[in-house]
């Protein structure tokens, strides 16, 4: 058993059945000794008397918030969460599996720049009694700050039968370096309680590897004098890092038809600008990359041809 | 540059740009390896890393170039040894057309034009990191590609920067 | 010396599960992946899935999923592999194997435990 | 899936001769500087044995009579001077995707 915050505690069980469960032993907060009764929730039935109360945890019906009381006063709560550990791994029913980049993964982070400013989100199917809390640091042994926002609800989705809940945290490196090679990794950590359960989930990344630019922005088209070909023009997004000299983009350019069957041309450049065949009924595209490091491209930039 | 004079900003800008293309070709971005293998205790941090005070950011560079330019030396010989060694000669073999190879001597092309015959820079040792099985082997060459490829990002920033803002 | 001891032949009814145990001793357990793999008889072999110790992550082939549970006791050094709901198709020779990292060949396996469903 | 096609199903092979298998991939098995595909021998009533790593790196305590080779899609296993106890069923193994498959095998006969 272990503190999560002031009167609340997590109780760790392994989870099969018949399993004996683990002794608890809750002390009331008072200076108090005699006289001292103990109930659970909402229920007026005495569990026991006494400063102390042993109870034995075994699931859910033994979690919850028990109250000493004492001629009718309430004395001190302990809140008892449960967390579940089923064949040696920790459960992770709140959170779902968003399976990309790989199975098991249930935090995604991205920064739009090395500012040390970034974004986790994760998706749950649950709508109610649900509570978050985030922590972050730079390193795990010697850790460095890192400042996380509160969690909130960021998106709802129907999914088939299903309604799915996005929440999303913004944090911040307190002492961020842009320029310097990271060597310890960003590790988030999300504490998730649904009802009476507790459940823990990480992710550790450099910020390096969450990278995805924002698109390039003002994307013009300049016709070329008696030519099909057109002048695309483009600027690096506002929030990317500067000076543009030092972190630098590369570029994607994309002349895609109407149909999605169309061959695609595709030109990569490092300029701002680019000379491309505009086709009737076409688009014209354009992703940003870090130059330098092969982290994630933005999402496209697009005009229509005409 | 030993003695404070300026690096050939363009050519190390070229160089070190092949640099970070020859990396990623040697260790693409994303293999199931690396979504099988992650949060592992084997770690690389005793690879020499540019850090924050190494002045190798955009005001670092215009107050004094050679601090910076000193730190990249030291890592670009660092792992050019380490891509000489058995860690990478030893089993399993690379392939015949690897990127190594080339990876290799453009290490040891920047690192001389950085510090041409007779100057010395002091240069980290290399720790004995060969590990006894191939697996073993084989990990330890992904994450020393992988730091590497984070080591020349950094690297090609500066001698973009540099050749954009501090070229004669 | 590294082994890979495997419970002993299981005949159960259809319908029915069963739980195959592989005790691994002379090795760092943690260190390698531990592989399941089926050979039904005069057959190749098929890839059940694996555990990677290394963040006790669990994967299955998808041909496998929902007959097969993979388990692991880290104190004993024990894998478990459980097949529920077990048809005629499931008589098989199932085999634990240690899986290297880095390139996941299977270097030393199990004698194997032979499994027979039928009434 | 990748699937691994081995050819011949069986091969007799005069003592000290050159034996040669074949297994060809359904895609590519490489990634960055290596071929993801191993291989393994089986005797009647044992498990498998590895013997080839990584498409052509001798396991350790394999004879060097073994050899493999290959590149991209097709792969070799040979085995020269072929010898008495080599009789065995030989299998190819993807790990470059996930599931991991095996060959269908090749039955070595030692005339």
């Known amino acids: 058993i272990w503190e999560l915050k002031k009167d609340v505690y997590v109780v760790e069980l392994d989870w099969y059945p018949d399993a004996p469960g683990e002794m608890v032993v809750l002390t009331c907060d008072t200076p108090e000794e005699d006289g001292i009764t103990w109930t659970l929730d909402q229920s007026s039935e005495v569990l026991g008397s006494g400063k102390t109360l042993t109870i034995q945890v075994k699931e859910f019906g033994d979690a919850g918030q028990y109250t000493c009381h004492k001629g009718g006063e309430v004395l001190s709560h302990s809140l008892l969460l449960l967390h579940k550990k089923e064949d040696g791994i920790w459960s992770t029913d709140i959170l779902k599996d968003q399976k990309e980049p790989k199975n098991k993964t249930f935090l995604r982070c991205e920064a739009k720049n090395y500012s040390g400013r970034f974004t986790c989100w994760w998706l749950t199917t649950i709508s109610t009694d649900l509570t978050f809390s985030v922590k972050s640091s730079r390193g795990s042994s010697d850790p460095q700050g890192v400042t996380c926002g509160a969690a909130t609800l960021s998106a709802e989705r129907v999914r088939g039968d299903n309604k799915e809940y996005e929440y999303s945290v913004e944090c911040q490196e307190d002492s961020a370096c842009p320029a310097a090679e990271e060597s310890l990794p960003i590790e988030v950590m999300v504490d998730a309680v649904h009802k009476l359960k507790y459940e823990n989930y990480t992710s550790s990344f450099f910020i390096r590897d969450i990278i995805k630019p924002d698109p390039p922005k003002n994307l013009q088209l300049k016709p070329l004098k008696n030519s099909r070909q057109v002048e695309v023009s483009w600027e690096y997004p506002d929030t990317w890092s500067t000076p543009h000299s030092y972190f630098s983009l590369t570029f994607c350019v994309q002349v895609q038809g109407k149909s999605k069957r169309e061959k695609k041309d595709r030109v990569f450049t490092d300029k701002t600008s680019a000379t491309v065949i505009c086709r009737k009924n076409a688009s014209i595209s354009v992703r940003a990359q870090d130059r330098y490091y092969s982290s994630s491209w933005s999402e496209w930039a697009s005009v229509p041809c005409s | 540059v030993p003695g404070g004079s300026s690096p050939a900003w363009t050519q190390c800008q070229q160089l070190s740009q092949k640099l970070c293309t020859l990396a990623w070709s040697a260790h693409p971005l994303v293999g199931h390896m690396d979504l099988r293998e992650e949060g592992d205790e084997e770690t690389t941090n005793d690879v020499p890393h540019i850090q924050c005070g190494d002045g190798c950011d955009p005001q670092g560079l215009r107050d004094n170039s050679q601090f910076c330019l000193q730190r990249i030396h030291q890592g670009l010989i660092f792992y050019e040894k380490l891509l000489g060694s058995d860690i990478f000669t030893g089993e399993p073999s690379l392939l015949p057309d690897s990127p190594v190879g080339q990876l290799h001597a453009s290490l040891l092309g920047l690192s001389q034009l950085l510090q041409p015959e007779g100057h010395h820079w002091e240069t980290q040792q290399i720790p004995s990191l060969s590990p006894s099985q191939p697996w073993q082997r084989l990990l330890l060459r992904f994450k020393i590609l992988r730091s590497l490829q984070a080591f020349v990002a950094v690297a090609a920033r500066v001698f973009a920067h540099g050749a954009a803002t501090l070229s004669p | 010396e590294v082994q890979l001891q495997q419970s002993g032949p299981e005949l159960v009814k259809p319908g029915a599960s069963v739980k195959i145990s592989c005790k691994a001793s002379?090795?760092?357990?943690?260190?390698?992946?531990m592989n399941w793999v089926r050979q039904s008889h005069g057959e190749s072999l098929e890839w059940i899935g694996d555990f990677n110790h290394n963040n006790d992550v669990i994967t299955y082939n998808p041909k496998f999923k929902g007959k097969v549970t993979l388990t692991v006791e880290k104190s004993s050094t024990t894998a478990y592999m459980e097949l529920r709901s077990l048809s005629s198709e499931d008589s098989a020779v199932y085999y634990c194997?240690?899986?290297?990292?880095?390139?996941?060949?299977?270097?030393?396996w199990g004698q194997g435990t032979s499994v027979t469903v039928s009434s | 899936d990748i699937v691994l096609t081995q050819s011949p199903a069986s091969l007799a092979v005069s003592l000290g001769q050159r034996a040669t298998i074949s297994c060809r991939a359904s895609?590519?098995?490489?990634?960055?500087?290596?071929?993801?595909m191993h291989w393994y021998q089986q005797k009647p009533g044992q498990p498998p044995k590895l013997l080839i790593y990584l498409a052509s790196n001798l396991e350790s305590g394999v004879p060097a009579r073994f050899s493999g080779s290959g590149s991209g899609t097709d792969f070799t296993l040979n085995i020269h001077p072929v010898e008495e106890e080599d009789a065995a069923t030989y299998y190819c193994?993807?790990?470059?995707?996930?599931?991991?498959?095996f060959g269908g095998g090749t039955k070595l006969e030692i005339k």
């Open positions: 895609k590519s098995v490489r990634f960055s500087d290596y071929f993801y």
């Open positions: 193994q993807n790990s470059r995707e996930l599931p991991y498959t």
């Open positions: 002379g090795y760092t357990f943690t260190d390698y992946y």
């Open positions: 194997a240690r899986g290297l990292r880095g390139y996941y060949a299977m270097d030393y």
